[in-house]
Interface confidence: low
């Protein structure tokens, strides 16, 4: 249970950054993920754009408490969730959103964490246990990362929608215009 950044002892730990870092897992009902930002049908993407500078993704602030076993931070921390399609800004959205927005063999751009910051938090524990101090790694900015079809699925999984947008407690319900009907096809849909 709990976030990968923690061990259940008194040590302070900041995990090493991997090339494709995983955002923190959901923390026992206390992570705010902007479910509404989960939405948005992938726009039609009729051609490949080479210039990554044209791509942008959303940096969504959210507040949550850090937990480590039964202990919880005295104050919530604020970090970013990386969200949104990485599409060229000049393209119009597809009204129905049922088509892939990249060429079948073209590049795939994902909105992923770019920079991190470390923050020390004090954890309060039940039963009169001594407070613990932790350093946690928080997402500080996001970027669009260009992938190719040659990236294997384990790499893709690291910043797939379920990782970037924890869905705990969400009941599946139909989306406007049936945009979820072909979610398997739209790998990068939320």
């Amino acid at each position: 249970q709990g976030w990968q950044a923690f061990k259940n002892d008194a040590t302070e730990i900041i995990p090493g950054l991997r090339e494709y870092p995983e955002p923190p897992q959901e923390l026992e009902n206390n992570q705010t993920m902007n479910r509404a930002e989960n939405g948005g049908r992938p726009p039609h993407h009729p051609y490949d754009t080479k210039d990554v500078s044209e791509y942008s993704c959303r940096e969504l602030h959210y507040t949550r408490f850090v937990t480590d076993g039964p202990c919880r931070s005295a104050k919530p921390v604020t970090e970013l969730v990386c969200s949104g399609q990485c599409g060229p800004a000049r393209l119009l959205p597809n009204a129905i959103g049922r088509v892939k927005w990249w060429r079948p063999n073209g590049p795939d751009f994902r909105c992923i964490p770019d920079r991190y910051r470390a923050q020390r938090v004090q954890l309060l524990c039940p039963g009169g246990a001594a407070p613990r101090s932790r350093k946690v790694r928080l997402v500080a900015s996001c970027k669009c990362k260009r992938l190719t079809r040659f990236h294997n699925q384990s790499e893709l999984k690291d910043f797939g929608p379920e990782t970037a947008r924890p869905q705990k407690g969400r009941k599946p319900r139909p989306r406007a215009r049936g945009a979820k009907a072909n979610q398997a096809e739209l790998e990068n849909a939320y």
Epitope: N30, R35, A36, G39, G40, R41, R58, T63, G84, G169
Partner: antibody
Framework: QVQLVQSGAEVKKPGSSVKVSCKAS????????LNWVRQAPGQGLEWMGT????????TYSQKFKGRVTITADKSTSTAYMELSSLRSEDTAVYYC???????????WGQGTTVTVSS | DIQMTQSPSSLSASVGDRVTITCSAS??????LNWYQQKPGKAPKLLIY???SLHSGVPSRFSGSGSGTDFTLTISSLQPEDFATYYC?????????FGGGTKVEIK
């Protein structure tokens, strides 16, 4: 049908606090973000913050951070917005609004007029 | 914060006119733009979301277009009930921000 019903008008003194309620019905309260937006007389709309009642996660506009607190009572499907250290420029109509999955505010409360006057 | 600028701030038009309102974002917001209609003393009503998707129950004379930083709300044939103030709103980044509004008045 979806309804958001807000509490009645308030008149407050500068420096005091106000707590506005927003009772939701017609949908699963915990499944949607609930936002607060205000509108000063003759002015435009200003977003204040949001809550996700499922686990009480909140996000606030930097402008109001420290002065605004948004809470939710799941048992009554009611959200609350408390604004402290009131000043005359906080005189406005305060709206709650449900946020749909594509980021749109699809249902709004009728508004609560808060007047701050000495 | 992303600034949303609407133009014109007000316009006079007649029933049957084609009306165009523009909304400009201070930075690219892709398609994350909504339009609302507000009448005096009433709460805003959602018209269009995600740049061009019509909210349920909204007449088809309303349409939206644009991407990046420039967006347009068009009323193809203005009806008496359309005289109101219209707001754009971005949800690309927090905080959510609204345009200053465009008041559509009877000529």
């Amino acid at each position: 049908q979806v309804q958001l019903v807000q509490s009645g008008a308030e008149v407050k003194k500068p420096g005091s606090s106000v707590k506005v309620s927003c009772k939701a019905s017609g949908y699963t309260f915990t499944d949607y973000f609930l936002n607060w937006v205000r509108q000063a007389p003759g002015q435009g709309l200003e977003w204040m913050g949001t809550i996700y009642p499922y686990h009480d996660g909140t996000t606030y506009s930097q402008k109001f951070k420290g002065r605004v607190t948004i809470t939710a009572d799941k048992s009554t499907s009611t959200a609350y917005m408390e604004l402290s250290s009131l000043r005359s420029e906080d005189t406005a109509v305060y709206y709650c609004a449900r946020e749909e999955e594509d980021g749109q505010f699809d249902y709004w409360g009728q508004g609560t007029t808060v007047t701050v006057s000495s | 914060d992303i600034q949303m600028t609407q133009s014109p701030s007000s316009l006079s038009a007649s029933v049957g006119d084609r009306v165009t309102i523009t909304c400009s974002a201070s930075q690219g917001i892709q398609w994350y733009l909504n339009w609302y209609q507000q009448k005096p003393g009433k709460a805003p009503k959602l018209l269009i979301y995600y740049t061009s998707s019509l909210h349920s129950g909204v007449p088809s004379r309303f349409s939206g277009s644009g991407s990046g930083t420039d967006f347009t709300l068009t009323i193809s044939s203005l009806q008496p009930e359309d005289f109101a103030t219209y707001y754009c709103q971005q949800h690309s980044k927090l905080p959510r921000t609204f345009g200053g509004g465009t008041k559509v008045e009877i000529k």
